[in-house]
C-alpha cells in the first residue's frame, strides 16, 4: 500500500523536510502533489510526467519545495504555515490514480529564555515569590532548576500557569540559590541565565564569644557579637542594661571586679526591621592564690600503702586539674579523683609512682599551676644479684664478689660463706684462693625502711681441673628454614678457653655460624636438615681442659615433594595396582590418598586389586608434617587400558 | 502563476564574458535556493552554481570554480550567472532550477538559454 513518512516528523522552522514516498506502483505516467487531505487543483504544489522527468509548480508551490523522481518530496526553510497535511497523487499508465497522505509539524527554534521575578528582595518566613519563564511560547513545556537539579518536592513549591511560573511560598534562607528555567518543544532546548533568590532573614538570637564568663582582675575583656542575617546586622552593646556602643565587637583592657555584670548584644536588621538580643553574666574575680599539693603519706611502702595527695587552698566553683610526668592523668584502676577533683589517690603505690606530681586550679583563661611533688616510695629489696656470674676458680687467683639488689632507701648487705656470717659490706674479696675457698656464698640484702630482707646463694668451686661441660639450648626442636638455634656452653669459668666441635671436626666456616659471649655460645641461624648433627663444646685453660657429651640437634623439616613408586603410568586391565608414598619428613608425615579428587586410605601404600579402565584417573599422594605445619602432595595420571591394547607396559601384582 | 524565466545566452568568443538572468515570479527566491544547471549534447546533464540566499551560502562546480560567480538580488527576485573566461566546454542550455542544498537535487522548468563559445 503507498505511504508517506516524514522525515523528520517534528520540524524545526528553516530546517528541511522530507516527505517520502513507500511502495510506490509500478509503470506510471506521473505524480502532483497536494497541500492538505485531498487532491484540489488550487492547492497543487509540483507535478512530475516520468516520460519528459519535468517537474511543473502548481499554485501552491513556494520555490521552496523538490520533486524527486522516486516522488519525494523536499521542503527546504520550513515555516510555521507549512504544518499539516501533504496528498500525493499518483497517475498509473492506465490512468487509474492512488492516493497517499503524509504530515509533519513545524515548531520554532525556541529564543533563550529569561526569569522574571515578582519580589526581588522576599522576608523569611513571611513573603513568597513568584518566579515566570518568558517568553510565553505555544507547544513549549517549561521546566525550572534550582542549583542545576530538578525541583525539590517541596510543599513550599508550586508550579502553575502551565509550568511556566514557579512560586516559592514563605521563603526561607535555603531559598537562596541559583533558579533557571528551560523551555522545550520538540524540536529544541533552551535554558535561562540564573538568577539568585536574594531572602532577607534575621536576625537570629546572637551568639556571643568567647563562652567564657570568668576572669581574673587585670585581665582584658574582648567580645565578639554574631548573628545570622542579610543583610548583616547591625550590633550594639549594653552593661547593666546601659549602651555602650555600637560595634560587632566590645574591648575593656585591664577589667576589674567592677567590670561584673550583664552584658548584652543587640542585633538589628534594618531591612526586615527585627531585633534580637543575648545576655551573658561576666564574673570578674580578683587573683587567686598559687596552688599547693598536701599529701598524706610521705614515705609509702611498695604494694601497701595508698598516698592521697590533696590540691590546696580549697575554693568554691573552681576546677581543679593534675599532671603526672608533666602528662594529663592516665587512665589508671589505681589512680582515683575526688568529686571534686581535688584529691588525687594512688592506690597501692609502686617505685615508679615517684611523679612529679602538679596539680593546678583552672580560672577560665588561665591555670595556676603548684610546684611539682615527689613521692618517696620505699621498695625493695628485689632479689640481690652476684657478679661476676663465674662459678669456678683456679686456686691462687683473687675472689672479688659484688652485690646488688634495688632498694628505696638502698639496702644494707651482708656476706655468709656455708651459713657463716663473714662481713657486712656489698663486696666480698678474698685474695689467693684455696681448694678450701669452695662452697656456698650467700649475700643477703636487707631494707631498714620496710624490714624486708632478699637473699641470693652462689656456688663457687675452686679447683685446678676444670668441670665436665654440658650443653644448653634455647630450642630442642627446631624447624628447617625457619628457627635459629643458641648452643650454650656450661658453666661459665674465669679464664677459660670455649671451643666447639661439629661432627668431631671443629667448626665449618659458614655465615649461618656465630660465635659470640667468649665463643661459649653457638648460634646456628636459618636451621637445615644438615645441620641434625653432633655437637660438643670444651673448656680449657692452661691447667687442664675437658669437653661436653655430644648433644644431637633434632632439626624438624618437611614434608618434601613427595614421590610415588613405581614410576609406570599404564597398566593392563586385571592388575593390581601397588602404588607406594614417600616424602623426606621429620618426624614422619601423615599420608593420605585422593583418587580423582576422592579421598582413599590414610596409609603409605594404595593398593588396589585386579583394576579395570573404570581405575583411570588421577591418583593424588598428600604428605602433612604436624610438627612443621607443612602440607606437600603430587599428583599421577593412570591409565588402565583392556588386556592386550596397553600403549605402554604393564605393572603386574 | 509560477515561473523561471532565463535570459542573457549568446554566442562569445573563448575567454569571452556573459551574465545570465534567472526572474522568477509566483514565489520568493529569498526563500529557497537557486541553481544554474546546463545540458549540452552528449555530455552529463551538470549543476555549475548554487546560491541560498536565507542561509546565504553558495557552491560551485569544479569546472567552473574562479571563473563563474552567482549572486541574487531579491528586491528583483532575480538570480544572476556572471561567467567569466568562458571556454568551448562551456557551451550548452543554461536552466534556471530549484536547487536543494541538502539533498543536491534540483528541478527546473524554464526553457533555458542557450551559450555558445567559438571563434
Known amino acids: 500500500k503507498l505511504t508517506i513518512e516524514s522525515t523528520p516528523f517534528n520540524v524545526a522552522e528553516g530546517k528541511e523536510v522530507l516527505l517520502l514516498v513507500h511502495n510506490l506502483p509500478q509503470h506510471l505516467f506521473g505524480y502532483s502533489w497536494y497541500k492538505g487531505e485531498r487532491v484540489d487543483g488550487n492547492r497543487q504544489i509540483i507535478g512530475y510526467v516520468i516520460g519528459t522527468q519535468q517537474a511543473t509548480p502548481g499554485p501552491a508551490y513556494s520555490g521552496r519545495e523538490i520533486i524527486y523522481p522516486n516522488a519525494s518530496l523536499l521542503i527546504q526553510n520550513i515555516i510555521q504555515n507549512d504544518t499539516g497535511f501533504y496528498t500525493l497523487h499518483v497517475i498509473k499508465s492506465d490512468l487509474v490514480n492512488e492516493e497517499a497522505t503524509g504530515q509533519f509539524r513545524v515548531y520554532p527554534e525556541l529564543p533563550k529564555p529569561s526569569i522574571s521575578s515578582n519580589n526581588s528582595k522576599p522576608v523569611e518566613d513571611k513573603d513568597a515569590v513568584a518566579f515566570t519563564c518568558e517568553p510565553e511560547t505555544q507547544d513549549a513545556t517549561y521546566l525550572w532548576w534550582v542549583n542545576n537539579q530538578s525541583l525539590p518536592v517541596s510543599p513550599r513549591l508550586q508550579l502553575s500557569n502551565g509550568n511556566r511560573t514557579l512560586t516559592l511560598f514563605n521563603v526561607t534562607r535555603n531559598d537562596t540559590a541559583s533558579y533557571k528555567c528551560e523551555t522545550q518543544n520538540p524540536v529544541s532546548a533552551r535554558r535561562s541565565d540564573s538568577v539568585i533568590l536574594n531572602v532577607l532573614y534575621g536576625p537570629d538570637a546572637p551568639t556571643i564569644s568567647p563562652l567564657n564568663t570568668s576572669y581574673r582582675s587585670g585581665e582584658n575583656l574582648n567580645l565578639s557579637c554574631h548573628a545570622a542575617s542579610n543583610p548583616p546586622a547591625q550590633y550594639s552593646w549594653f552593661v547593666n542594661g546601659t549602651f555602650q556602643q555600637s560595634t560587632q565587637e566590645l574591648f575593656i583592657p585591664n577589667i576589674t571586679v567592677n567590670n561584673s555584670g550583664s552584658y548584652t548584644c543587640q542585633a538589628h536588621n534594618s531591612d526586615t526591621g527585627l531585633n534580637r538580643t543575648t545576655v551573658t553574666t561576666i564574673t570578674v574575680y580578683a587573683e587567686p592564690p598559687k596552688p599547693f599539693i598536701t599529701s598524706n603519706n610521705s614515705n609509702p611502702v611498695e604494694d601497701e600503702d595508698a598516698v592521697a595527695l590533696t590540691c590546696e587552698p580549697e575554693i568554691q566553683n573552681t576546677t581543679y586539674l593534675w599532671w603526672v610526668n608533666n602528662q594529663s592523668l592516665p587512665v589508671s584502676p589505681r589512680l582515683q579523683l575526688s568529686n571534686d577533683n581535688r584529691t588525687l589517690t594512688l592506690l597501692s603505690v609502686t617505685r615508679n609512682d615517684v611523679g612529679p606530681y602538679e596539680c593546678g586550679i583552672q580560672n577560665e583563661l588561665s591555670v595556676d599551676h603548684s610546684d611539682p611533688v615527689i613521692l618517696n616510695v620505699l621498695y625493695g629489696p628485689d632479689d640481690p644479684t652476684i657478679s661476676p656470674s663465674y662459678t669456678y676458680y683456679r686456686p691462687g687467683v683473687n675472689l672479688s664478689l659484688s652485690c646488688h639488689a634495688a632498694s628505696n632507701p638502698p639496702a644494707q648487705y651482708s656476706w655468709l660463706i656455708d651459713g657463716n656470717i663473714q662481713q657486712h659490706t656489698q663486696e666480698l674479696f678474698i685474695s689467693n684462693i684455696t681448694e678450701k675457698n669452695s662452697g656456698l656464698y650467700t649475700c643477703q640484702a636487707n631494707n631498714s625502711a620496710s624490714g624486708h630482707s632478699r637473699t641470693t646463694v652462689k656456688t663457687i668451686t675452686v679447683s685446678a681441673e676444670l668441670p665436665k661441660p654440658s650443653i644448653s639450648s634455647n630450642n630442642s626442636k627446631p624447624v628447617e628454614d625457619k628457627d635459629a638455634v643458641a648452643f650454650t656452653c656450661e658453666p661459665e669459668a674465669q679464664n677459660t678457653t670455649y671451643l666447639w666441635w661439629v661432627n668431631g671436626q671443629s667448626l665449618p666456616v659458614s655465615p649461618r655460624l656465630q660465635l659470640s659471649n667468649g665463643n661459649r655460645t653457638l648460634t646456628l641461624f636459618n636451621v637445615t636438615r644438615n645441620d641434625a648433627r653432633a655437637y660438643v663444646c670444651g673448656i680449657q685453660n692452661s691447667v687442664s681442659a675437658n669437653r661436653s657429651d655430644p648433644v644431637t640437634l633434632d632439626v624438624l623439616y618437611g614434608p618434601d615433594t613427595p614421590i610415588i613408586s613405581p614410576p609406570d603410568s599404564s597398566y593392563l586391565s586385571g592388575a593390581n595396582l601397588n602404588l607406594s608414598c614417600h616424602s623426606a619428613s621429620n618426624p614422619s608425615p601423615q599420608y593420605s590418598w585422593r583418587i580423582n579428587g576422592i579421598p582413599q586410605q590414610h596409609t603409605q601404600v594404595l593398593f588396589i586389586a585386579k583394576i579395570t579402565p573404570n581405575n583411570n584417573g588421577t591418583y593424588a599422594c598428600f604428605v602433612s608434617n604436624l610438627a612443621t605445619g607443612r602440607n606437600n602432595s603430587i599428583v599421577k595420571s593412570i591409565t588402565v587400558s583392556a588386556s592386550g591394547t596397553s600403549p605402554g607396559l604393564s605393572a603386574g601384582a | 502563476e509560477v515561473q523561471l524565466v532565463e535570459s542573457g545566452g549568446g554566442l562569445v568568443q573563448p575567454g569571452g564574458s556573459l551574465r545570465l538572468s534567472c526572474a522568477a515570479s509566483g514565489f520568493n527566491i529569498k526563500d529557497t535556493c537557486i541553481g544554474w544547471v546546463r545540458r549540452a549534447p552528449g555530455k552529463e546533464e551538470e549543476l555549475v552554481a548554487a546560491?541560498?540566499?536565507?542561509?546565504?551560502?553558495?557552491r560551485y562546480a569544479d569546472s567552473v570554480k574562479g571563473r563563474f560567480t552567482i549572486s541574487a538580488d531579491t528586491s528583483k527576485n532575480t538570480a544572476y550567472l556572471q561567467m567569466n573566461s568562458l571556454r568551448a566546454e562551456d557551451t550548452a542550455v543554461y536552466y534556471c532550477?530549484?536547487?536543494?542544498?541538502?539533498?543536491?537535487?534540483?528541478?527546473?522548468w524554464g526553457q533555458g538559454t542557450t551559450v555558445t563559445v567559438s571563434s
Open positions: 546560491i541560498c540566499t536565507y542561509k546565504g551560502t553558495t
Open positions: 532550477a530549484i536547487y536543494s542544498h541538502y539533498y543536491d537535487y534540483y528541478n527546473y
